[in-house]
């Protein structure tokens, strides 16, 4: 009798795996193997796939075969007992274009109200992704255990912190990666589950914000207790984005070592320009809070982000503020190349009672204004970038008498 | 293959210095922080301080700073620890290890060092 | 500064035991510890990282637990390879514990 070809063969490639998968033609005829071949482009012959030669079973693996999994591929199969069937070849394929990204490796860790979250490609020194190792970035669904609502975040890199959890809770989260770059998305990982911690004494710092003043930072911060003690450390941030580095090398600012107040200044030459994150803890000299959440801030932004400059054109019963761009020593104007938003606080010289006004336009009208009283007018700039959420500090106060009634037009 | 090859046994009298070293090999040692330990006969493993040797950034136990220094050349792979104002309590087993984040992942097979006169 | 506390020095098991290690630290430091095996005349060895996570071609007799405070080193089924100390370490402090050592009945 006649051997049939096998039918229906699969390829399922997940990151360095390739496996193949395939139909018996002829359920009745007992004792069969399958063989395989392969051909690269642009040769003619063919060449035994190792791995799957002489199979009883439907499935093979021939991860063991190093290929250029940028080169198409073509694959034959055939039935063998005593004689053979004839080939069924498999249509051609790139491996690296069919590939899946597996599920990545996830590795936790607790404190009271927060969850860092490792996270490594589930292949270590991948033949596949060797080109993409850097392009991975990951996205995750976490949940409470006890209610099963699910938050989903994207866009994170190899370690991501995530914030504001309730002590002695477990929280279950599931990974996946994706390459952008390929249009692939790769696989969920296992569900992993961690509880956080009991409370912490003392509660890590809060409201971390870098403003420049003369040729210094200024970092401020606010907390809980008095008489404690704060250091303030730093890191480049593309490190977070380094597949499989685990080790974290923070590094302290030398003058907010051991500070005693809520704030520190250092020389901006700190910092070569790029973008970093900072983090803050507290401690009373017996214990020590966990850090703060980290803040990314950028040299480039936070260099330039100045308070604006603002004139005043007085009414009887508003302001007109035209608002310009900040000067620089030398008095040139500072080009600001990112859209910002402006600020404007004003209150009666005589009040405390302060108002605020939040404009994107450069002229602003302060309505409702008493004739003949002096206010007084702050302002700042905010970057309208969610994600580099930066401020600059207030300007200095100016104070303006209004015009006596009928002199609004 | 990673590996922590350490300077032979040392016999040194008191007041004296001594450098001990850690040659690496299987990885760079700037990606990582090196550490010392100590262990003195019959007692746990004490921490002495480490480098971060990309940029020779140190940090000491409060027991140890002004008597331990450590350096690394990132060139030859190779971590140092000097001791110095020698005394018998220094005699000890002295490791270097490798940290990777999470614990020290890899030691050297230690060094035995004898202060005695 | 953190103090990590192996309050018994000793602990006497057999083989087929199931025994506990327990360190504790002087404040809440999350998950951040690590388990170390130390055979006489041999290096340490991780065991445990991550107050839970077995370090690799670590037998699955080893098992870490617990969090904030008290932290566990439990060895089911123990093997006469495993007579050694255990120390505890916090991995951010880099402090160790005393250290426990198993002896067999």
């Known amino acids: 009798k006649n051997l049939k070809s096998p039918q229906k063969v699969e390829v399922d490639i997940i990151d360095d795996n390739f496996i193949l998968r395939w139909n018996r033609s002829d359920e009745s005829v007992g004792n069969v193997t399958f063989s395989f071949d392969y051909q690269k482009t642009g040769m003619d012959n063919w060449i035994k796939l190792s791995g799957c030669q002489n199979i009883t079973s439907t499935k093979c693996n021939f991860s063991s075969l190093k290929l250029n999994v940028y080169e198409e591929i073509k694959l034959r199969i055939r039935a063998e007992k005593e004689n053979t069937s004839s080939w069924y070849e498999v249509d051609s394929f790139t491996p690296f274009r069919k590939a899946q990204i597996g599920p990545p490796e996830v590795h936790l860790e607790a404190e009271d109200k927060a969850i860092v979250i490792h996270i490594s490609p589930g292949t270590k020194d991948s033949v596949m992704w060797a080109l993409d190792g850097l392009s991975f970035t990951y996205s995750l669904v976490i949940w409470k255990n006890s209610s099963g609502v699910e938050e989903r975040i994207e866009n994170i890199y190899s370690r991501h912190k995530i914030y504001k959890l309730s002590p002695e809770t477990t929280y279950c989260l599931k990974v996946k990666a994706a390459l952008l770059t390929s249009w692939k998305i790769g696989v969920y990982s296992p569900v992993h589950c961690i509880k956080t911690t009991v409370e912490n004494e003392l509660p890590p710092p809060e409201n971390i914000e870098v403003s420049v003043q003369n040729q210094n930072y200024v970092l401020k911060w606010d907390y809980t207790y008095a008489n404690m003690t704060f250091q303030v450390q730093w890191l480049h941030a593309f490190l977070k984005r380094n597949p499989g580095n685990h080790l974290y090398k923070w590094k302290q600012i030398p003058d907010c070592e051991n500070v005693k107040t809520t704030q520190c200044v250092f020389p901006q030459n700190v910092f070569q320009k790029g973008i970093y994150l900072l983090r803050v803890q507290a401690s009373d000299g017996n214990n020590t809070s966990f850090w703060s959440e980290e803040i990314k801030f950028d040299t480039e932004i936070q260099a330039f982000l100045l308070p604006p400059v603002f004139n005043i054109r007085s009414l009887s019963d508003s302001f007109h503020i035209y608002i310009g761009a900040p000067k620089q020593s030398g008095n040139t104007p500072v080009i600001q190349d990112y859209p910002l938003i402006y600020e404007i606080i004003f209150w009666e010289n005589t009040s405390n009672a302060e108002r605020k006004i939040i404009e994107k336009k450069t002229d602003v009208t302060v309505p409702n204004l008493k004739p003949l009283t002096v206010y007084c007018v702050k302002a700042r700039a905010h970057t309208m970038d969610e994600k580099l959420n930066k401020s600059s500090v207030f300007s200095d106060a100016v104070c303006e008498k209004t015009k006596p009634g009928n002199t609004s037009k | 293959e990673v590996q922590l090859q350490q300077s032979g046994a040392d016999l040194v009298k008191p007041g004296a210095s001594v450098k001990l070293s850690c040659t690496t090999s299987?990885?760079?040692?700037?990606?990582?922080?090196m550490h010392w330990v100590n262990q003195r006969t019959e007692q746990g493993l004490e921490w002495i301080g480490r480098?971060?040797?990309?940029?020779?950034?140190?940090k000491y136990a409060p027991k140890f700073q002004g008597k331990a220094t450590i350096t690394a050349d990132t060139s030859s792979n190779t971590a140092y620890l000097q001791l110095s104002s020698l005394t018998s309590e220094d005699t000890a087993v002295y490791y270097c290890?490798?940290?990777?984040?999470?614990?020290?992942?890899?030691w050297g097979q230690g060094t035995t060092l004898t202060v005695s006169s | 500064d953190i103090v990590m506390t192996q309050s018994q020095k000793f602990m006497s098991t057999s083989v087929g035991d199931r025994v506990s290690v327990t360190c504790k630290a002087s404040?809440?430091?999350?998950?951040?510890v690590a388990w170390y095996q130390q055979k006489p005349g041999q290096s340490p060895k991780t065991l445990i990282y991550?107050?839970?996570y077995r370090y690799s071609g670590v037998p699955d007799r080893f098992t870490g637990s617990g969090s904030g405070t008290d932290f566990t080193l439990t060895i089911s089924n123990v093997q006469s390879e495993d007579l050694a100390e255990y120390f505890c370490?916090?991995?951010?402090?880099?402090?160790f514990g005393g250290g426990t050592k198993l002896e067999m009945k």
């Open positions: 299987g990885f760079n040692i700037k990606d990582y922080y």
């Open positions: 480098i971060d040797p990309e940029d020779g950034e140190t």
């Open positions: 991550s107050a839970s």
């Open positions: 404040q809440n430091v999350g998950t951040t």
């Open positions: 370490q916090q991995y951010n402090s880099y402090t």
């Open positions: 290890a490798r940290d990777w984040g999470h614990s020290f992942d890899y």
